[in-house]
């Protein structure tokens, strides 16, 4: 057993038929010694009495909220929430494997830049009674300073017959240093409770593999005079760490038909423009990575050709 | 041609050797074993390699102050990695294949390397660690580690010299 | 074309050594590891060992230590297998190959130990 | 030393059968599995690399699966030229080992 927070404490169990359980000890928060009772929850039975409560946990049942009291006033509370271990392995009922980039990714982050600002998502199909909380920080053994805000409701998506609920945090490294080599990863720890359950999930990653620009801005068009070509011309996105000297962007540019079937034409290029065919009802994109290390590309910016 | 007594190196040689170095490292990458072996010894293996860090210079106005420093723990690097690749880890049991870029790679660490500190010019470098793994699939890990961390290094030495090409040439 | 062309059959008395060339051709000799294999008549594969042409380091199955003997001549691009205090269990086929991945294999060389 | 164990020893097929080789190892090798045909009177040919990866040249009917001590080698529709030996080999450790084989005949 330990605290998660305040008057609230995790119950490790191994999770099988007939599990002998875990025996917790309560002790009311007081200086009273005599008359303490206690209860579960809005049950009015009473389920011993003393400053000590001695308690067998093995089921949802045995957690919740337990209140012990003298005369009617209540003197202290402690929140038993169950972490459960089925064959070696906690569970993960909370939130829905995403499966990218691999099996068994329940969070996943993005980088607009290398400024140590990033953005984690997690996705579940619980709506109600669920809460969840971020930590993250650079290293483990040491660790610097990463500041998270509160998770939000982000999305609301239907999935067949299920609603899917979106929720993301954003993150800022304390002393982010964009020009660096990262040497050590950043960690990231959400503790996800819903009802009587307690769940944690983590993710480790350097802020270079995360990274995802934003897709280039002004992307324009300028027919060149008796040619079927035009020159496509844009920006770097306003969110992209700078100098663009030295963060420096590459880019693709593909001419894509209105049928999907339609072979696309693309162009690679470091230049913030291009020359390409212009054809009838197509419609040309460009997107951006990080010119030195191979990590997402952006989303496309797109204009017609017409 | 380089860097002797602190003069300026040929930005934009350096810059496209440093650009070349990025791609052949990219390239190395998937073809030194396979893909998924992130999960296999979580330990360290790969501690020891040289970071270019906050304090190096490596950054713009760093560089604009007095990129010594920073050219200088490049070098490092470029000498570390260009022995780690020429080790037993990478010409040891399984052999790379015979398209591997690896050997490319190695030769390309060598030539920035030398572009940075002509000859008679000496700064000192980092003792490489004596990783000698024994089995094959050690070695498969720590190829797959050492790219990797190389791929970062190179990105960092990369946006330098691009950087340096454009604003710190004559 | 990466060939591997292995001596001619043996045949020998029991106490005696033979030494069976596996000489490269179609590749540079010095960037690929040269593995033995032996095959014992109707049976499965036994990995003997490889040599790193490159600096002459052979690494031996324990098994065939001080049985077998890997040498290579870079300028003749060949590797070379001794074996000494020959047996009837030594009796086999005896294949070099390049590592697994790259998968060139000599035609085998026959030994023979008999009376 | 790991030791690779392969069943079944023979295996009896019409042309057109799918059929499944089985190959497991003492010790978790993860996927540093390579598998090999040897016809009668040739040298042994590499099918697959790393348990799962094909290798050019080899038809597409070859296919592995398999990780840490369990792994299989499929052929989905077998040919009368398929006949001849199947070894798996471990590629984690050395000494490199292999199976005793798996000799496949055409009924």
């Known amino acids: 057993i330990w605290e998660l927070k305040k008057d609230v404490y995790v119950v490790e169990l191994d999770w099988y038929p007939d599990a002998p359980g875990e025996m917790v000890v309560l002790t009311c928060d007081t200086p009273e010694e005599d008359g303490i009772t206690w209860t579960l929850d809005q049950s009015s039975e009473v389920l011993g009495s003393g400053k000590t409560l001695t308690i067998q946990v093995k089921e949802f049942g045995d957690a919740g909220q337990y209140t012990c009291h003298k005369g009617g006033e209540v003197l202290s509370h402690s929140l038993l929430l169950l972490h459960k271990k089925e064959d070696g392995i906690w569970s993960t009922d909370i939130l829905k494997d995403q499966k990218e980039p691999k099996n068994k990714t329940f969070l996943r982050c993005e980088a607009k830049n290398y400024s140590g600002r990033f953005t984690c998502w997690w996705l579940t199909t619980i709506s109600t009674d669920l809460t969840f909380s971020v930590k993250s920080s650079r290293g483990s053994s040491d660790p610097q300073g990463v500041t998270c805000g509160a998770a939000t409701l982000s999305a609301e998506r239907v999935r067949g017959d299920n609603k899917e609920y979106e929720y993301s945090v954003e993150c800022q490294e304390d002393s982010a240093c964009p020009a660096a080599e990262e040497s050590l990863p950043i960690e990231v720890m959400v503790d996800a409770v819903h009802k009587l359950k307690y769940e944690n999930y983590t993710s480790s990653f350097f802020i270079r593999d995360i990274i995802k620009p934003d897709p280039p801005k002004n992307l324009q068009l300028k027919p060149l005079k008796n040619s079927r070509q035009v020159e496509v011309s844009w920006e770097y996105p306003d969110t992209w760490s700078t100098p663009h000297s030295y963060f420096s962007l590459t880019f693709c540019v593909q001419v894509q038909g209105k049928s999907k079937r339609e072979k696309k034409d693309r162009v690679f290029t470091d230049k913030t423009s291009a020359t390409v065919i212009c054809r009838k009802n197509a419609s040309i994109s460009v997107r951006a990575q990080d010119r030195y290390y191979s990590s997402s590309w952006s989303e496309w910016a797109s204009v017609p050709c017409s | 041609r380089a860097v002797p007594g602190g003069s300026s190196p040929a930005w934009t040689q350096c810059q496209q050797l440093s650009q070349k170095l990025c791609t052949l490292a990219w390239s190395a990458h998937p073809l030194v074993g396979h893909m998924d072996l992130r999960e296999e010894g979580d330990e360290e293996t790969t501690n020891d390699v040289p970071h270019i860090q906050c304090g190096d210079g490596c950054d713009p106005q760093g560089l604009r102050d007095n990129s010594q420093f920073c050219l200088q723990r490049i070098h490092q690097g470029l000498i570390f990695y260009e022995k780690l690749l020429g080790s037993d880890i990478f010409t040891g049991e399984p052999s790379l294949l015979p398209d591997s870029p690896v050997g490319q790679l190695h030769a390309s660490l060598l030539g920035l390397s030398q572009l940075l500190q002509p000859e008679g010019h000496h700064w000192e470098t980092q003792q490489i660690p004596s990783l000698s793994p024994s089995q094959p699939w050690q070695r498969l890990l720590l190829r797959f580690k050492i790219l990797r961390s190389l791929q970062a290094f190179v990105a960092v030495a990369a946006r330098v010299f691009a950087h340096g090409a454009a604003t710190l040439s004559p | 074309e990466v060939q591997l062309q292995q001596s001619g059959p043996e045949l020998v008395k029991p106490g005696a050594s033979v030494k069976m060339s596996c000489k490269a051709s179609g590749y540079t000799f010095t960037a690929y590891n040269m593995h033995w294999v032996k095959q014992s008549h109707g049976k499965s594969l036994e990995w003997i060992g490889y040599i790193n042409p490159n600096n002459g380091i052979p690494n031996y199955n324990q098994k065939f230590k001080g049985k077998a003997t890997l040498t290579v001549n870079k300028s003749s691009s060949t590797a070379y297998m001794e074996l000494r205090s020959l047996t009837s269990e030594d009796s086999a086929v005896f294949y070099c190959?390049?590592?697994?991945?790259?998968?060139?294999w000599g035609q085998g060389t026959t030994l023979s130990v008999s009376s | 030393d790991i030791v690779m164990t392969q069943s079944p020893a023979t295996l009896s097929v019409t042309p057109g059968d799918r059929v499944s080789l089985s190959c497991r190892a003492s010790q978790s090798i993860r996927d540093y599995l390579y598998w090999y045909q040897q016809k009668s009177h040739e040298s042994p040919r590499l099918l697959i690399k790393f348990a799962s990866q094909s290798i050019s040249g080899i038809p597409s009917r070859f296919s592995g699966s398999g990780s840490g001590s369990d792994f299989t080698l499929s052929i989905n529709s077998v040919e009368p030229e398929d006949v001849g030996v199947y070894y798996c080999q471990n590629g984690h450790s050395f000494p490199y080992t292999f199976g005793g084989g798996t000799k496949l005949e055409i009924k």
């Open positions: 190959a390049l590592n697994w991945d790259l998968d060139y």
